[in-house]
């Protein structure tokens, strides 16, 4: 699986999950998030060669097409597969609010 | 929606479905498919600016991050959303076989 366990331990050029730390204030300009100060959102990148974690029949066909026709511009793209939520603390006036934001952290990638 | 109705009618630089005709014999080297001779598989391509058909909270955050930090290399990618099947005819010996291959035709795209 193209997950953090594999991708963070190996120098992998092809599609894999990559570490990306986002500081809410510095990177997004968000002052409203009290905790955490930032988080590892991660992202997916890298080429998608034939059969690399192909998501659908279309991505298999497109990967095959791209392999056999290297001049082609059409190829599958490396995108998130499994995502996890992030719990944040913010304030409405002086009242603390805890909210779980779904699909905030990329744990693995696929070729789609 | 970033579907064939919209994308094929407009000159759209950003994420959209693009026409791609695949000839089974010429492009994939497949002699075994009797009918059709080829089909419009289509593909997704184009940049994913902030809020363009964002698939998840992560793609929204990543689009925002990318907009506010243009030097960043992390950005959402344009990938298939809706796919349709394709029915093919092939032969096993002299016996004709009809099979429906799922997820073969891209009808719309999203930023993931």
């Amino acid at each position: 699986a193209l997950d953090t366990n594999y991708c963070f331990r190996n120098l992998e050029e092809n599609c894999c999950v990559r570490p990306l730390y986002i500081d809410f204030r510095q990177d997004l300009g968000w002052k409203w998030v009290h905790e955490p100060k930032g988080y590892y959102a991660n992202f997916c990148s890298g080429p998608c060669p034939y059969l690399r974690s192909a998501d659908t029949t279309h991505s298999t066909v497109l990967g095959l097409y791209n392999t056999l026709n290297p001049e082609a511009s059409a190829s599958p793209c490396c995108v998130p597969q499994d995502l996890e939520p992030l719990t944040i603390l913010y304030y409405v006036g002086r009242t603390p609010k805890v909210e779980q934001l779904s699909n905030m952290v990329v744990k693995s990638c696929k070729c789609s | 929606a970033l579907d064939t109705n919209y994308c094929f009618r407009n000159l759209e630089e950003n994420c959209c479905v693009r026409p791609l005709y695949i000839d089974f014999r010429q492009d994939l080297g497949w002699k075994w498919v009797h009918e059709p001779k080829g089909y419009y598989a289509n593909f997704c391509s184009g940049p994913c600016p902030y809020l363009r058909s964002a698939d998840t909270t992560h793609s929204t955050v990543l689009g925002l991050y990318n907009t506010l930090n243009p030097e960043a290399s992390a950005s959402p990618c344009c990938v298939p959303q809706d796919l349709e099947p394709l029915t093919i005819l092939y032969y096993v010996g002299r016996t004709p076989k009809v099979e429906q291959l799922s997820n073969m035709v891209v009808k719309s795209c999203k930023c993931s």
């Epitope: 059969l51 029949t57 066909v61 095959l64 | 994939l28 080297g29 497949w30 075994w32 092939y90 096993v92």
Partner: nanobody
């Protein structure tokens, strides 16, 4: 029952040659069309890398093996071969056979792999 049996691996000196073969056996390969046959290779800590691929009338090779390796297939025997010439130490890997079959979609089957070691 479906099986891919690979053979031909071994220890060879730099500049030497080996011929790998992979035979697909089982009723699946007689009933359903084969849409692609390929050889991949794997080294520790890395994902499988495509070495060579063949469909009915098209082939493709990884840049690192072009001009040295040749993939071929015998449809009557459901066998795919990889002729490897001018082998180099960086070709050392486990070589894994892959067969793609049209069976309720595009299904892929993998062999167990055969070790190729290039060393003096």
């Amino acid at each position: 029952q479906l099986q891919l049996v690979e053979s031909g691996g071994g220890l060879v000196q730099p500049g030497g040659s080996l011929r790998l073969s992979c035979t697909a056996s089982g009723s699946t390969f007689e009933i359903y069309p084969i849409y692609a046959m390929a050889w991949f290779r794997q080294t520790p800590g890395k994902q499988r890398e495509l070495v060579a691929l063949t469909t009915d009338v098209k082939t493709n090779y990884a840049d690192s093996v072009k001009g040295r390796f040749t993939i071929s297939r015998d449809n009557a025997k459901n066998t795919v071969y990889l002729q490897m010439n001018m082998l180099q130490p960086e070709d050392t890997a486990v070589y894994v056979c892959n067969v793609g079959v049209v069976r309720g979609g595009l299904q892929n089957y993998w062999g167990q792999g055969t070790q190729v070691t290039v060393s003096s």
